[in-house]
Interface confidence: low
């Protein structure tokens, strides 16, 4: 586009500028070529030898112009039409440009400081002559020349009138810009444009509202000599929130999201999930639902699975082995990376199940405890004679630390059956002498319930270091056992089984074993000792 | 999920008109420049209109070889887009895709199914 | 209108290999160049837009070059799934032209 710094025909007043000697140029009014009043200068001192008719015009600030073009309409008179001034008469008129800070006022053009520089010479392309007077046939001619580069503020023109006779209809004086203008999503500003010999101008744009470039790498455009932007360079994105609308970034509305300014568009939010806000970058998931840390915000929320289905076990007594299988949960929360985990407790054999107890490190779980992707378990090392609750929980992604011990679990209670459920530690040193042990443990079936009083216990007992099979064997009905004719100072082990008479004896095993070394001869007295 | 629909292709006889529509979904319709492209054997892919904003006064722009026979048109309030076709030939045959512009970047991320249209006797 | 002139019109390759899809625009359109590919029976799909950005979900071995004029597009070690046709379109100016196409085929 063209920015103008002067137009001649847009002034209705009284141009005003400066005319030097008076009898040279002369301000007049008339109309352009479509009768609208203008206001022109004249001069046409023809017959009259050595004319130097000078007129200059106002200060013209020159913008943010450097290249300035300057266009000027003019008639001139054919001086072969005019009688007798065939010696006198030019057909020629100079124009000049002079640069200033500031307004020089009316005085004389060749004044103020720096010499005007000559622009160039004018001439007609079409002269008019007497006959084209008559008939109102004024040619108008048009020029246009360059100026610049420009350096001070502003300027005056000035016309040099040498002897011709010569109508100025118009003086239009502009400069040529790129507009400014969004592109990429990037604003450009208005961009003065270099003359058309240089080397296009090269605008960094700045990225609109909410929005954002290649980092140190700001879109980019060309101001042409004709004031059109040329070869764009990069783009800007809308920021996360943010899509683009045309020529600007608007915000993802409710309901919408954009994580990164890599995607163009908003993206609705993903299943039981919401955004409730303008610009939202994610979408928050519903009450009980989740994402997992490693779930995209892309992904549909989701939620912890229900409990497995149809737990079932079978329980082998010999070795004591319980085996575990169940179905998927009904409802896996959505999610695919369902896994599960399971718990066991051992439980009185009676009474509440509260009265449960974690089974400790000694059980073993085949092929894992937590994070089975089988539907399947295996338990090992289980006492006989024992109550255990085994837990089986359902588990995905988002599944919270405490969900194994939360509701979505099926569980089963199974009973071991008689046996010798004891731990180690569970059997008690009464007494240590030379030539004795004395030793009891808990009743594996409590006094008074069914069962209690059929129960026996075998006690096998050998040197140890020496081979199992040299063992002796001692049975009693209680819970207690001395055992005598042992050699002093010797280290023995002991193993307990307990079993209902009948054929489930032969199926219980020794379990577990103990060490206890006796006292030597020196010793005087008896020892009581605690449980190990 | 972004999707377009188009609907009303089939076959219609030389000089006769035909209406095409396109139902859009899981985006703001109102704000995005929407566009019919068309895909023969004979030509391939071809541009055929656009349609811009309610802020650009819903300003339609045309390719040469439909001006003044085809009308595009849009119903924001029924995320939907139209193609009034008249005067049809036998070169406008081909599958007429919906599909829309980021802003004024005039790159075609998202297309319809397409909807055949055969211009016959 | 700006012709857009694509090269080869057909290509056949085996998986694993690079093959490259050159076109020409008939003026100077810059960097306003995008990459479509077509399955049979299916719509045009965006790969590429402003000459080399993928669009989300692209494989990286897609790569877009050029400026002005000449633009190619390069797939390396071609996958069985990149079978298709290919179209290059300006988006400088209304209205945006595409190419006529590339079938790249199985060997």
């Known amino acids: 586009e063209e920015v103008i710094l002067l137009d001649s025909k847009a002034s209705q007043a009284e141009l005003g500028w400066t005319a030097l000697p008076s009898n040279g140029w002369e301000e007049i009014s008339g109309v352009d070529e479509h009768d609208r009043p203008i206001r022109t200068y004249q001069v046409c001192n023809v017959l009259e030898p050595n004319q130097d008719n000078w007129l200059q015009t106002g200060w013209i600030s020159r913008g943010r112009g450097q290249r300035i073009f300057v266009e000027l309409q003019f008639t001139l008179r054919d001086c072969s039409s005019i009688p007798g001034a065939a010696g006198t008469c030019k057909e020629t008129f100079n124009v000049y440009y002079l640069e200033t800070e500031a307004d020089l006022g009316r005085g004389r053009p060749r004044l103020g400081g720096s010499r005007p520089r000559k622009i160039d010479t004018i001439a007609a392309d079409e002269s008019f002559t007497q006959g084209d007077l008559g008939e109102r046939k004024m040619k108008l001619n048009t020029e246009v020349r360059e100026i610049g580069p420009l350096s001070r503020r502003g300027f005056h023109l000035a016309f040099q009138d040498v002897g011709a006779c010569v109508a100025l209809v118009s003086v239009r004086v502009y400069y040529k810009q790129c507009r400014a203008t969004v592109r990429g999503l990037a604003t450009f500003p208005a961009t003065a444009a270099e003359s058309a010999f240089s080397t296009l101008v090269e605008v960094a744009g700045t990225c609109v509202a909410h929005s954002e470039g290649e980092p140190g790498s700001p879109p980019r455009m060309h101001c042409g000599a004709d004031g059109e932007w040329l070869v764009p360079v990069g783009r800007c994105s809308c920021s996360a929130g943010f899509q683009e609308r045309g020529d600007f970034c608007e915000a993802c509305p409710p309901g919408f999201y954009k994580v990164s300014p890599r995607r163009p568009l908003c993206s609705p939010c993903p299943e039981h999930s919401r955004a409730l806000e303008n610009a939202s970058t994610f979408c928050v998931c519903q009450d009980s639902y989740a994402r997992s840390p490693t779930d995209p915000p892309s992904a549909s929320c989701t939620r912890p699975p229900s409990a497995p289905r149809d737990l079932q076990y079978s329980l082998s007594r010999s070795p004591l082995v319980l085996r575990l299988r169940w179905l998927p949960p009904a409802d896996s929360g959505g999610r695919s990376d369902v896994t599960y985990s399971l718990l066991c407790l051992r439980c009185g054999r009676e009474g509440p199940a509260g009265a449960c107890e974690p089974c400790g490190p000694r059980v073993a779980f085949l092929p894992r405890q937590a994070g089975l992707r089988e539907r399947a378990a295996t338990l090992l090392h289980l006492r006989p004679g024992a109550r255990y609750t085994v837990r089986v929980a359902a588990l995905n992604g988002v599944s919270g630390p405490a969900a194994a011990a939360g509701t979505t679990y099926a569980q089963v209670t199974v009973s071991t059956g008689p046996g010798a459920p004891w731990e180690e530690d569970e059997i008690r040193r009464d007494r240590v002498e030379p030539q004795s042990v004395s030793l009891s443990w808990r009743e594996p079936i409590p006094a008074g319930a069914p069962g209690a009083n059929d129960t026996e216990y075998e006690i096998r007992y050998y040197e140890k270091g020496q081979s199992e099979q040299t063992y002796s064997m001692v049975k009693t009905g209680a819970p207690t056992v001395t055992v005598t004719n042992l050699k002093p100072a010797t280290r023995y082990v002991f193993q307990i089984r307990a079993a209902s008479p009948g054929p489930s004896w032969e199926a219980q095993s020794f379990n577990p074993s103990i060490e206890v070394q006796t006292l030597g001869e020196a010793a005087s007295g008896s020892r009581d000792q605690s449980p190990a | 999920e972004v999707k377009l629909e188009e609907s009303g292709g089939g076959l219609v006889q030389p000089g006769g008109s035909m209406k095409l529509s396109c139902v859009a979904s899981?985006?703001?319709?109102?704000?995005?420049?929407m566009n019919w492209v068309r895909q023969s054997p004979e030509k391939g892919l071809e541009w055929v209109a656009e349609?811009?904003?309610?802020?650009?006064?819903?300003?339609?722009h045309y390719a040469e070889s439909v001006k003044g026979r085809f009308t595009i048109s849009r119903d924001d309030s029924k995320s939907s887009v139209y193609l009034q076709m008249n005067n049809l030939r036998a070169e406008d045959s081909g599958i007429y895709y919906c599909t829309f512009y980021y802003g004024s970047s005039a790159w075609f991320a998202y297309w319809g199914q397409g909807t055949l249209v055969t211009v016959s006797a | 209108d700006i012709q857009m002139t694509q090269s080869p019109a057909s290509l056949s390759a085996s998986v694993g290999e690079t093959v490259t899809i050159t076109c020409r625009a008939s003026e100077n359109i810059y960097s306003y160049l995008a990459w479509y590919q077509q399955k049979q029976g299916k719509s045009p799909q965006l790969l590429v837009y402003n000459v080399k950005t993928l669009t989300e979900g692209v494989p990286s071995r897609f790569s877009g070059s050029g400026s002005g004029t000449q633009f190619s597009l390069k797939i390396d070690s071609l996958q069985p799934e990149d079978f298709g046709s290919y179209y290059c379109q300006h988006h400088y100016v209304t209205p945006p032209t595409f190419g006529a196409g590339t079938k790249l085929e199985l060997k």
């Open positions: 349609i811009r904003l309610k802020s650009n006064n819903y300003a339609t």
């Open positions: 899981g985006f703001t319709f109102s704000y995005y420049w």
